[in-house]
Interface confidence: low
């Protein structure tokens, strides 16, 4: 039995709210609408939310009950379309109400917004959160579920489910902990951090299925999952894929309740069949529902199995490699990708696809040659380069890294792709450089074996970053082209950009590096990225400065910032002084 | 849909032989090369044999040397494992799997080699 197949359901919300039981119905309904009407104020919401469950509720005690057999779609697009305010907030996204299903529901889709203009989340006292999590903990987590959600439509709905159980939990131990906050906040920096991971992970993962299609999500999980499961045989590796596409699929298109519930299914067939599957499964699977998928997701590669025959046999020697790739294209090219990741977790993801997609143009090209065979004999030899170039980029920046710290290694990425993408925004290109310079705290401690996996995978996820936000206000042809050609060639395209020479510099403007006493009170991290707009800004206007000019103006900042913190009149210190820093620092570059 | 259905294990006696077949469907078999493996009663996977999608490449782990031969039939998508020279360590429930994976999703067939 297929894990997905099920009996026909006369009504398919009564079927979901049976599955995955009121709280969680309600919880991922909420999620789904604040994706969708990323505006509308949280009582909104929750009125919807709760009038859907009433619904639901009815069809459950009486499935023939009138419209309880509509689509899921058909009924939450009904209901978003109920909002009085929809023209005046969303614009012409109202136009998507005048649309049928499924035209309707892909225009929603469409309006999805991956930057929306939300004031940023201000942490209040913990005394205050811990009040109002005990006044009313359902109304508190549901709006940690509607915050999230609305600012990051595309999250792993399932998966934020598991992180406002987290968040729960951290508020029921520290509000009644000694010291509330030395138990509270790290715990919720930890939450955060990890959620904007988690959403740019499954952005990336939403990406490659609506730009590049299922044949690439089925292919970037056929290696992620052979080299985590390399004892699996290759039937049950093609089969967790085709569940996994299927599960991700729905949560990319808007379908949450079918998405949660097919994940619980799958993370109940891979338990089932852990024997079958990986060794490293048995602790994920004693775990509660969320937990257990959450888990499972996250788990370490297994052991590879001991003295695998090489891959040439098959691939390269075997005189039926062109019948065989002829008669079964893609499946052929899955076992390649399946026995070439599971012996190579040490690979990037997007390396090994990049490997299959030489094999696969090269079958492409030596099939049809007169001697087939000594066309592709040496086709192995062709992956050499394409294995070297990440490594030595990994070597390269892990030196850097290691000899700047995190903080300058950031700085020296925001020069050097202010440079290749100068039109992009400021925002993004700090946003993005910051969270490139992270590959190094996160990459460059692992041994050798676990670096490339590691950073070229990362780098892939926060490349992603850019491009979502680049095609949102597309400005760079160049950032157009390395973001639509290829999505395993992302970081090779960007890593090739040189200095555009193209872009005419920006006019100085002495208002972009004029500073205030209010600098003074920030923390470290809105301090440095103060610091890291103005290097970005720097670029702008003098794309050819070098880096010897660039280090002495961002001194001479670091050392304005601290004296004037530190003067009795900071108000004064920051404006006298900052206009000299201004005149040396056009001196320096020649401005 | 993925299947791989063993057949032909059973109670043999030492010295006896027995054949294996695997009868394969919902992928292209001709397309990849096969192995046979086995799990003893408390102990894990272990690999025996593997062949290539054409059959003109065998391979075996050294204890079954001489005595298993494995084979093929792209025609009828089935693999074979011949058996000879049986022997009580031999007993096991034996897998056919695609590739050279040592783990399954099949069924498998129980062969038991005893006096």
């Known amino acids: 039995r297929g894990v997905f197949r099920r009996d026909a359901h006369k009504s398919e919300v009564a079927h979901r709210f049976k599955d995955l039981g009121e709280e969680n119905f309600k919880a991922l309904v909420l999620i789904a609408f604040a994706q969708y009407l990323q505006q509308c104020p949280f009582e909104d919401h929750v009125k919807l939310v709760n009038e859907v469950t009433e619904f639901a509720k009815t069809c459950v005690a009486d499935e023939s009950a009138e419209n309880c057999d509509k689509s899921l779609h058909t009924l939450f697009g009904d209901k978003l379309c109920t909002v009085a305010t929809l023209r005046e907030t969303y614009g012409e996204m109202a136009d998507c109400c005048a649309k049928q299903e499924p035209e309707r529901n892909e225009c929603f889709l469409q309006h999805k917004d991956d930057n929306p203009n939300l004031p940023r989340l201000v942490r209040p006292e913990v005394d205050v959160m811990c009040t109002a999590f005990h006044d009313n903990e359902e109304t508190f987590l549901k709006k940690y579920l509607y915050e999230i959600a609305r600012r990051h439509p595309y999250f792993y709905a399932p998966e934020l489910l598991f992180f406002a159980k987290r968040y729960k939990a951290a508020f029921t131990e520290c509000c009644q902990a000694a010291d509330k906050a030395a138990c509270l906040l790290p715990k919720l920096d930890e939450l955060r951090d990890e959620g904007k991971a988690s959403s740019a992970k499954q952005r990336l993962k939403c990406a490659s299925l609506q730009k590049f299609g299922e044949r690439a999500f089925k292919a970037w999980a056929v290696a992620r999952l052979s080299q985590r499961f390399p004892k699996a045989e290759f039937a049950e590796v093609s089969k967790l894929v085709t569940d996994l596409t299927k599960v991700h699929t729905e949560c990319c298109h808007g379908d949450l309740l079918e998405c949660a519930d097919d994940r619980a299914d799958l993370a109940k067939y891979i338990c089932e069949n852990q024997d079958s599957i990986s060794s490293k499964l048995k602790e994920c699977c004693e775990k509660p529902l969320l937990e257990k998928s959450h888990c499972i997701a996250e788990v370490e590669n297994d052991e590879m199995p001991a003295d695998l025959p090489s891959l040439a046999a098959d691939f390269v020697e075997s005189k039926d490699v062109c019948k065989n790739y002829a008669e079964a294209k893609d499946v052929f090219l899955g076992m390649f990708l399946y026995e070439y990741a599971r012996r190579h977790p040490d690979y990037s993801v997007v390396l090994l696809l990049r490997l299959a997609k030489t094999y696969e143009t090269t079958l492409e090209k030596c099939c049809a040659a007169a001697d087939p065979h000594e066309c592709y004999a040496k086709v192995f030899d062709e992956f050499k380069p394409l294995v070297e170039e990440p490594q030595n980029l990994i070597k390269q920046n892990c030196e850097l890294f290691e000899q700047l710290g995190e903080y300058k290694f950031q700085n020296a990425l925001l020069v050097r792709y202010t440079k290749k993408v100068p039109q992009v925004s400021t925002p993004t290109l700090v946003e993005v450089s910051r969270n490139l310079g992270k590959v190094g705290s996160k990459c460059c401690k692992h041994p050798e074996a676990k670096r490339m996996p590691c950073a070229e995978d990362y780098l892939s996820v926060v490349l992603n970053q850019l491009c979502v936000l680049h095609e949102k206000t597309p400005v760079s042809d160049r950032v157009t082209k390395c973001c639509t050609e290829s999505l395993v060639n992302r970081r090779p395209c960007f890593s090739a950009l040189e200095v555009d020479e193209t872009y005419v510099p920006k006019e100085f403007n002495a208002e972009t590096f004029t500073f205030h006493a209010d600098i003074c009170t920030l923390s470290e991290k809105e301090r440095q990225i103060k610091k890291q707009t103005a290097l970005v800004e720097l670029v702008k206007h003098k794309p050819k400065a070098t880096k010897e000019q660039l280090k002495a103006v961002m001194d001479d900042f670091a050392a304005f910032v601290e004296k004037c913190c530190k003067a009795d009149d900071k108000e004064t210190c920051f404006a006298e002084e900052g206009k000299k820093l201004v005149a040396a620092s056009q001196a320096a570059l020649g401005l | 849909q993925v299947q791989l259905q063993e057949s032909g294990g059973g109670l043999v006696q030492p010295g006896n032989s027995l054949r294996l077949s695997c009868a394969a469907s919902?992928?292209?078999?001709?397309?990849?090369?096969m192995s046979w493996v086995r799990q003893a009663p408390g102990k894990g996977p272990e690999w025996v044999s593997s062949i290539n999608s054409s059959g003109d490449d065998t391979r075996y782990t050294d204890s079954v040397k001489g005595r298993f031969t494995i084979s093929r039939d792209n025609a009828k998508s089935t693999l074979y494992l011949q058996m000879n020279s049986l022997k009580p360590e031999d007993t096991a429930v034996y897998y056919c799997?695609?590739?050279?994976?040592?783990?399954?999703s099949s069924q498998g067939t129980q062969v038991t080699v005893s006096s």
């Open positions: 919902g992928f292209s078999f001709r397309s990849f090369g």
């Open positions: 799997t695609i590739g050279s994976s040592i783990s399954r």
